[in-house]
C-alpha cells in the first residue's frame, strides 16, 4: 500500500507532473519546428542564394548577351547550360558566325568583347559541326596564327597546336608572310584550312564555353 | 510534382503529425496521472500497478545522463 | 549537404519521431485500457470518468466521414 498523501501534496505533484509533461511537449514541438524550419528555410535560402548567384552570373553576360538559350543538363534541376540566343551549341561550347568582314586581329577582339575567342578546332567532329553553318563562298578566320612567320602556329586560347589534328588544304600552309588561318571551301577537297594575310578582312567564327547556371 | 517538392510536402505532413501526436500523448499522460490520483482518493490505491507502469513510461521519455 | 539530401534527412528524423511517439502513445493507451478493465473488476467501475475521457481521446484520432 502506498502511504496516504495529503490532497494538497497530490495537487502539487500533479501540477509538477503537468509542467514536466507540457515542458517536454513544448521542447519536442520546438525541436520539430526547428527541424521543419531547417528543412524549409535552408533549402529556400539555398535556392535563393543559388538564384542570386545565377542572376549575378547572368548580369555578367547581359552586357554582351541580352538573352540566353538554356537547356537542362542531365536530370538535376540545378544544372542549366546556356548559350547566347543567336549562338549555336555543340558539346560544351557555343559558336557564333560573324558575318562582318574584319582583319584577324579585329575579329579576335570582336570575339573577346563577347566573352569568346576566334574558334579553336580540336576534333574532326567539331569541324564537321561548324561547317554545317558556313557558306561555301565565304572564308572564316580561325583562332590560329603564326606571329613570327616561322611556322610556329598557335591557338588563341593556348591549346597546344597538334599537327595530327589539323585540317589544312593540301599544299597549305604555303607562305611565311601569311600568318593567319582561315577555313574555306574548295570544290576538290571540300572544307579545309588555308593560311592568309592577317589584315585581309574575312568573316569569322567565335567560340566560347557554355555558360553554366 | 518534382522530387524535392514532394519531399517538402512530406516534411509538412510529418511535422503536423508530430505536433498533433505530441499534444495527444501529453494530454493522455496527464489524464492518466489525474486518474491515478483520483484512484487513490476513491479506493485507497487500487491502481498502484497502473501508477508504476506510468512511471515506467515516463522513464522512457525522461533523458538522464548516464553515471560517470 | 545538397538541398534535396537535407530534406530527406529531416524527413527521416520526423518519420522516426512520428513512429516512436505513435508507439509510446499506443503503449500508454493500452495501459490505460488495461487499467480501466482492472478497475471495473476490482471496484465496479470506479473509473467511469477515465473511460469516457479515453473515449474522447479516441474520437479525436478516429476519422469518420462527415454526414452527407
Amino acid at each position: 500500500m502506498v502511504p496516504e498523501e495529503e490532497p494538497q501534496d497530490r495537487e502539487k505533484g500533479l501540477w509538477w507532473f503537468q509542467l514536466k509533461v507540457w515542458s517536454m511537449a513544448v521542447v519536442s514541438i520546438l525541436l520539430l519546428s526547428v527541424c521543419f524550419t531547417v528543412s524549409s528555410v535552408v533549402p529556400h535560402n539555398f535556392m535563393y542564394s543559388k538564384t542570386v548567384k545565377r542572376l549575378s552570373k547572368l548580369r555578367e553576360y547581359q552586357q554582351y548577351h541580352p538573352s540566353l538559350t538554356c537547356v537542362m543538363e542531365g536530370k538535376d534541376i540545378e544544372d542549366w547550360s546556356c548559350c547566347p540566343t543567336p549562338w549555336t551549341s555543340f558539346q560544351s561550347s557555343c559558336y557564333f558566325i560573324s558575318t562582318g568582314m574584319q582583319s584577324w586581329t579585329k575579329s579576335q577582339k570582336n570575339c573577346s568583347v563577347m566573352g569568346a575567342d576566334l574558334v579553336v578546332i580540336n576534333t574532326r567532329e567539331e569541324q564537321d559541326f561548324i561547317i554545317q553553318n558556313l557558306k561555301r563562298n565565304s572564308s572564316y578566320f580561325l583562332g590560329l596564327s603564326d606571329p613570327g612567320g616561322r611556322r610556329h602556329w598557335q591557338w588563341v586560347d593556348q591549346t597546344p597546336y597538334n599537327e595530327n589534328v589539323t585540317f589544312w588544304h593540301s599544299g597549305e600552309p604555303n607562305n611565311l608572310d601569311e600568318r593567319c588561318a582561315i577555313i574555306n571551301f574548295r570544290s576538290s577537297e571540300e572544307w579545309g584550312w588555308n593560311d592568309i594575310h592577317c589584315h585581309v578582312p574575312q568573316k569569322s567564327i567565335c567560340k566560347m564555353k557554355k555558360i553554366y547556371i | 510534382l518534382g522530387e524535392p517538392q514532394l519531399c517538402y510536402i512530406l516534411d509538412a505532413i510529418l511535422f503536423l503529425y508530430g505536433i498533433v501526436l505530441t499534444l495527444l500523448y501529453c494530454r493522455l499522460k496527464i489524464q492518466v496521472r489525474k486518474a491515478a490520483i483520483t484512484s487513490y482518493e476513491k479506493s485507497d490505491g487500487v491502481y498502484t500497478g497502473l501508477s508504476t507502469r506510468n512511471q515506467e513510461t515516463y522513464e522512457t521519455l525522461k533523458h538522464e545522463k548516464p553515471p560517470q | 549537404l545538397g538541398e534535396p539530401q537535407l530534406c530527406y534527412i529531416l524527413d527521416a528524423i520526423l518519420f522516426l519521431y512520428g513512429i516512436v511517439l505513435t508507439l509510446l502513445y499506443c503503449r500508454l493507451k493500452i495501459q490505460v485500457r488495461k487499467a480501466a478493465i482492472t478497475s471495473y473488476e476490482k471496484s465496479d467501475g470506479v473509473y467511469t470518468g477515465l473511460s469516457t475521457r479515453n473515449q474522447e481521446t479516441y474520437e479525436t484520432l478516429k476519422h469518420e466521414k462527415p454526414p452527407q
Epitope: 586581329t105 606571329p147 588563341v156 607562305n175 608572310d177 600568318r179 589584315h199 | - | -
Partner: antibody, heavy 119, light 111 residues
C-alpha cells in the same frame, strides 16, 4: 635584302603640302607586307602615321585627321606620303618602313629624311 | 589611344652588367599568349631596328643577350651582359590597337 629609301623636300613652308616618296628595292610592294610612314620628332618621339598594304588597303592614324594620305605606284615599286596644311609641328624625320602583316611589328626601316617646316 | 610609358628615361650600366628597361601600357595589349608589344634599338643617325617582336621573340640576327618578357600591361627588355655596342635609345611599340603607338624611349649609356 629589301631596301627602302625616302626622298622629298627638306624644307616646306607652313600651310603647304608635304610630299615624300619611298622607293623599295628587293621586294615587290604588291606581294606582301604593310608599307608604313613613321615620323620622329625632335626629342626622339616616334609617331606611326599610317600604312598601305600589299593589296592596296590602307590604315591611317586618326590624329592626322584628313590631312594625310598614302598612295602607291606598283609599276615603280614606290609608295607616297602626302601631308596637307603643314605647320611647324610637322617638323620631323620621316621614315618609310615595312610592317609585318601580323603582329604588326616594323621589321625594316628606311634611313629617314629630315623635313623642316618653316617660313 | 594606348599610351606606352617607358622607364627609366635614361640609364648608365657598366660593361658586362644587366640593363633592364620597362614599358608600361595604359591598357592591356595582350591577346592571350600573344602580347602585341615590340622593342626597337636606335643608334644616333640611324633608323630604329627591330630587336624583339611579340614581347619575347628575338628577331633573326639579334644577339641572344637581348631578351623580352611581360604580359598584359607590363613589359621588360633585358640586356645581359651589356656590351659597348648596345649604347642606344630603346623604344617599345604596341600593335594591339590602332593607332600603333611608341614609348618615349630609354637612353642606355655604357659606363
Amino acid at each position: 635584302d629589301v631596301q627602302l629609301q625616302e626622298s622629298g623636300p627638306g624644307l616646306v613652308k607652313p600651310s603647304q603640302s608635304l610630299s615624300l616618296t619611298c622607293s623599295v628595292t628587293g621586294y615587290s610592294i604588291a606581294s606582301g607586307y604593310y608599307w608604313n610612314w613613321i615620323r620622329q620628332f625632335p626629342g626622339n618621339k616616334l609617331e606611326w602615321m599610317g600604312y598601305i598594304s600589299f593589296d592596296g588597303t590602307y590604315n591611317y592614324n586618326p590624329s592626322l585627321k584628313d590631312r594625310f594620305s598614302i598612295t602607291r605606284d606598283t609599276s615603280k615599286n614606290q609608295f607616297f606620303l602626302k601631308l596637307n596644311s603643314v605647320t611647324t609641328e610637322d617638323t620631323a624625320t620621316y621614315y618609310c618602313a615595312r610592317g609585318v602583316d601580323y603582329p604588326n611589328a616594323i621589321d625594316w626601316w628606311g634611313q629617314g629624311t629630315s623635313v623642316t617646316v618653316s617660313s | 589611344d594606348i599610351v606606352l610609358t617607358q622607364s627609366p628615361a635614361s640609364l648608365a650600366v657598366s660593361l658586362g652588367q644587366r640593363a633592364t628597361i620597362s614599358c608600361r601600357a595604359s591598357e592591356s595589349v595582350s591577346m592571350h599568349v600573344t602580347h602585341l608589344i615590340h622593342w626597337y634599338q636606335q643608334k644616333p643617325g640611324q633608323p630604329p631596328k627591330l630587336l624583339i617582336y611579340v614581347a619575347s621573340n628575338l628577331e633573326s640576327g639579334v644577339p641572344a643577350r637581348f631578351s623580352g618578357s611581360g604580359s598584359e600591361t607590363d613589359f621588360t627588355l633585358n640586356i645581359h651582359p651589356v656590351e659597348e655596342e648596345d649604347a642606344a635609345t630603346y623604344f617599345c611599340q604596341q600593335s594591339f590597337e590602332d593607332p600603333w603607338t611608341f614609348g618615349g624611349g630609354t637612353k642606355l649609356e655604357i659606363k
